[in-house]
Interface confidence: low
C-alpha cells in the first residue's frame, strides 16, 4: 500500500535549489530500483517533478497561495520489468502554506460618519474595514489613528471577530466648540515576519471625517446612582435624602422630579417634584424587603421630551421588631426509666431580624412552668438550649404527655420574646433506650417540625 501524509509547501519560496515537497513510497519498494514512480495531475512534470527511482517530489517554481492554495496530483508505482502497476493509482494533495506576503488594503480612501454631541466616551460611531488576501494570523489587521485633528477625541478599536476597525468617541464632544474632525486611520498587519519585510510596508491608510450633530441634552443627575438608607420604623413622610439634576444645555431649563411608578408599584416612596427630596408614603418592613430599587425621573419643564433616569437604592435598616421563635416544631419523647439530667432534645431558634453583632438568644421555662417542672431548660449560650430530665423515671400511665412552655428572648433593644411549646411523650423503652411502645400520637409524629406557639 502507499505510504505518505498530506504534503505541505510554503508559498513564495526564495531558495536557490528546488523546494523539497515530500516522498511517495510504496511498501512494495525493496530499494533495488525495480519500481518506477510516476506523477500526474495539477502541475505534474512542470511545477512538480518526481525522482522516478526514489519517489522524492520537488517544486520547481515559486508558488503563490493566493493564486492557487491546493494542488491535486495522482501517483503510480510500476514494476519496471513487467510494466505493471504494483499499487492502484492514488490521489494526493499538496497544500500551499500561507506567508504574510500581502498588505491590508482599504477599499476606499475616505470614510464619513456622524455622531451626536451627546455620545458618551466609548460610543461606536462607525466601522471601517481593510481587506488582506492572506489567511489566518497573516490576515489579521490592527487599526490605529495616526494623525488628524481628532487624534485625542476618538479611538479606533479592532474587532477581532470581524477584523473591522470601530471608531469610538474618546472624549466628550461639544457641537458649539467643533463640528467636524478629520482623522488618518492606518490598517496594519501585527504579525510580520522579518524575512518577508522586503515584500512591503504591510499597511494602508484612509481618511475618516466625523461630523458632530447638535443635540438638545436631557438633564444630568449629580450621581450615576444614589444609595440611601432609612430605619424600618420610620414614620410616613420621613425624608430619606434627595437627588439633584441639571439641564446641561446653555439654556439651563428648570427640571421637575418624579418616581417611575413601574419601579415602585406599591407607592412606598414619593418625591418633591421641585427640590428632589425623597420621603416615605407607607410604613416599611425590612423583613419583607431589605433593599428598594426605584428609579427617579428628571424632566425639563419646557421640553418634557427631555428626561433622564437615575437608580435609587434604598436600604432599610433593621430595628428589633420581631420575636425569636422555634426553628422547628419540637415533639420528642422520654423513656420511662430515664435518669435525671439526661438531654432529650436540643432547641434552636430563628429571628427574622438581623442584629449587627448577630443573634444572642436566651431560653428559659415560662414562669408558670418553672416551679415543680419535671424537666429543665439548659441555655447553651450559643443560641441553642437543651431539655433535660429533672427526675429519675417517668410513668406514662400517670402522665403520657408533657407540654413545656419555653420562653425565647433575643436580648436586643427593645427586647422581643415569644413562648413556644415543646411536646414530650413518655414511652416504654428497651434497655438500650430504644422506644418500644408509646402514646399513639408519638408514633404518628416522630420528631417532625414547625414553630412553637
Amino acid at each position: 500500500s502507499w505510504m505518505w501524509n498530506q504534503f505541505f509547501l510554503l508559498e513564495e519560496y526564495t531558495g536557490s535549489d528546488y523546494q523539497y515537497v515530500g516522498k511517495l513510497h510504496s511498501d512494495q519498494d525493496r530499494g533495488d530500483g525495480s519500481l518506477k514512480y510516476i506523477l500526474s495531475g495539477d502541475g505534474a512534470g512542470d511545477l512538480f517533478i518526481i525522482n522516478e527511482n526514489t519517489g522524492d517530489i520537488q517544486a520547481t517554481k515559486r508558488l503563490d497561495r493566493e493564486e492557487k492554495p491546493v494542488y491535486i496530483l495522482r501517483a503510480q508505482a510500476i514494476n519496471r520489468r513487467t510494466g505493471r502497476p504494483v499499487e492502484p493509482e492514488s490521489e494526493f494533495i499538496i497544500k500551499i502554506h500561507d506567508i504574510n506576503d500581502n498588505e491590508p488594503i482599504f477599499p476606499q480612501s475616505t470614510y464619513q460618519f456622524k455622531t451626536p454631541e451627546s455620545s458618551p466616551p466609548g460610543t461606536p460611531i462607525g466601522r471601517i474595514k481593510a481587506s488582506d488576501a492572506d489567511v489566518g494570523e497573516n490576515a489579521e489587521i490592527e487599526y490605529s489613528i495616526t494623525d488628524g485633528e481628532g487624534l485625542d477625541m476618538f479611538d479606533v478599536i479592532t474587532d477581532q471577530e470581524t477584523q473591522e476597525g470601530i471608531i469610538t468617541v474618546k472624549k466628550l464632544l461639544d457641537f458649539e466648540k467643533k463640528k467636524v474632525y478629520t482623522l488618518k486611520v492606518e490598517a496594519s498587519n501585527p504579525y510580520v515576519e522579518p524575512r518577508f519585510l522586503y515584500l512591503g510596508p504591510f499597511k494602508d491608510s484612509a481618511t475618516v471625517r466625523i461630523v458632530v450633530e447638535d443635540v438638545d441634552e436631557p438633564p444630568v443627575f449629580s450621581k450615576l446612582a444614589y444609595i440611601l438608607q432609612i430605619r424600618e420604623d420610620a414614620q410616613i413622610n420621613t425624608t430619606i435624602g434627595s437627588v439633584t439634576a441639571q439641564d446641561p444645555d446653555a439654556a439651563r431649563n428648570p427640571v421637575k422630579y418624579s418616581v417611575d411608578r413601574h419601579t415602585d408599584m406599591d407607592r412606598i416612596f414619593n418625591i418633591d417634584s421641585g427640590n428632589g427630596s425623597i420621603f416615605t408614603s407607607k410604613l416599611l418592613d425590612r423583613e419583607t424587603l431589605l433593599w428598594h430599587n426605584i428609579t427617579v425621573i428628571a424632566t425639563e419643564i419646557n421640553n418634557p421630551k427631555q428626561s433622564s433616569r437615575v437608580p435609587l437604592y434604598i436600604k432599610v435598616l433593621d430595628v428589633n421588631d420581631n420575636a425569636p421563635e422555634f426553628a422547628e416544631f419540637y415533639e420528642t419523647f422520654v423513656c420511662e426509666k430515664a435518669k435525671a439530667d439526661q438531654l432529650i432534645q436540643t432547641l434552636h431558634a430563628v429571628d427574622k431580624d438581623d442584629p449587627y453583632s448577630g443573634h444572642q438568644f436566651s431560653f428559659s421555662l415560662a414562669p408558670e412552668a418553672a416551679s415543680g417542672s419535671n424537666f429543665t431548660i439548659q441555655d447553651n449560650k450559643d443560641n441553642t438550649a437543651g431539655i433535660l430530665t429533672r427526675k429519675n423515671g417517668y410513668n406514662r400511665h400517670e402522665m403520657s404527655t408533657y407540654l413545656l412552655p419555653v420562653v425565647i428572648s433575643d436580648n436586643d433593644y427593645p427586647v422581643q420574646s415569644s413562648t413556644g411549646t415543646v411536646t414530650v411523650r413518655v414511652c416504654a423503652c428497651d434497655h438500650h433506650g430504644n422506644m418500644q411502645s408509646c402514646h399513639a400520637e408519638a408514633l404518628i409524629h416522630p420528631t417532625g417540625l414547625s414553630t412553637g406557639a
Partner: antibody
Framework: EVQLVQSGAEVKKPGASVKVSCKAS????????MHWVRQAPGQGLEWMGW????????EYNQKFQGRVTITADRSTSTAYMELSSLRSEDTAVYFC???????????????WGQGTLVTVSS | DIQMTQSPSSLSASVGDRVTITCKAS??????LAWYQQKLGEGPKLLIY???TLQTGVPSRFSGSGSGTDFTLTISSLQPEDFATYYC????????FGQGTKVEIK
C-alpha cells in the same frame, strides 16, 4: 472579563506618601465595592479599607485611620489608595480587590489586581 | 475584632494526596467565610465562598465545609498546580484573614 490592573512598583522614603491606582474593566465600576489589602514580605494578608465608587463612601481599618485615603474616578473606572507618613514597616505588596455585595460592604473578594510593590527605604 | 487561626502553617504532600486545612474563628461567623489560593508573585484567587460554595471555574477537587467557628478546606486529590499558599477570610464583621497555609511538594 473582569480585570483589575494596578500601577507599577514604587520606592519611597520614610515620611513620604504613595498613591497606587487600580483600573477596573469588564463590569460596572460604580456597582461594586473596591477593597484594598496589603501583604508584607513573607506575611499574610491585611485588609485596609473599601470605597463604593457609586457614591464615594469609604470605610477604613482603624489601624490605618488618618494615614490612608481611598478615592475613585468614575470617568476612568479607576480606584486609588494613598498612604501617607510612610515607615519601613509599610513595605508590602498592595492589592485592590472587587467585593461581591453580600448584604454588607462587599462580602468576599472575587477578583484581585496583580499587586503593586511599595518599598519604603531611606 | 474577630481573629482567624489557620492550621497547619505549612504542610508537605504528594500529587494525588488528600489535603485538609482548618480555620478557626474567634467568634461565631456563621457561614461568612471564603478560601483563597495564592501563588508566588500573584494576587489571591477566590476558591470557596459562604463556607462551602465553589466559585465558578474552580475544579471540583476543592471543597469547603463548616459553620460557626470551625471550617475546613479539602483538596481531594492534590494536583501539581495546587502547590501554593491558602488563606481563609471572614467577612461577617469587618474583614480578617488567617495567617496562611503553605502547601509544599514532599
Amino acid at each position: 472579563e473582569v480585570q483589575l490592573v494596578q500601577s507599577g512598583a514604587e520606592v519611597k522614603k520614610p515620611g513620604a506618601s504613595v498613591k497606587v491606582s487600580c483600573k477596573a474593566s469588564g463590569y460596572t465600576f460604580t456597582r461594586n465595592f473596591m477593597h484594598w489589602v496589603r501583604q508584607a514580605p513573607g506575611q499574610g494578608l491585611e485588609w485596609m479599607g473599601w470605597i463604593y465608587p457609586g457614591d464615594g463612601e469609604t470605610e477604613y481599618n482603624q489601624k490605618f485611620q488618618g494615614r490612608v485615603t481611598i478615592t475613585a474616578d468614575r470617568s476612568t473606572s479607576t480606584a486609588y489608595m494613598e498612604l501617607s507618613s510612610l515607615r519601613s514597616e509599610d513595605t508590602a505588596v498592595y492589592f485592590c480587590a472587587r467585593g461581591v455585595y453580600g448584604g454588607f460592604a462587599g462580602g468576599y473578594f472575587d477578583f484581585w489586581g496583580q499587586g503593586t510593590l511599595v518599598t519604603v527605604s531611606s | 475584632d474577630i481573629q482567624m487561626t489557620q492550621s497547619p502553617s505549612s504542610l508537605s504532600a504528594s500529587v494525588g494526596d488528600r489535603v485538609t486545612i482548618t480555620c478557626k474563628a474567634s467568634q461565631n461567623i456563621y457561614k461568612n467565610l471564603a478560601w483563597y489560593q495564592q501563588k508566588l508573585g500573584e494576587g489571591p484567587k477566590l476558591l470557596i465562598y459562604d463556607a462551602n460554595t465553589l466559585q465558578t471555574g474552580v475544579p471540583s477537587r476543592f471543597s469547603g465545609s463548616g459553620s460557626g467557628t470551625d471550617f475546613t478546606l479539602t483538596i481531594s486529590s492534590l494536583q501539581p498546580e495546587d502547590f501554593a499558599t491558602y488563606y481563609c477570610q471572614q467577612y461577617y464583621s469587618g474583614w480578617a484573614f488567617g495567617q496562611g497555609t503553605k502547601v509544599e511538594i514532599k
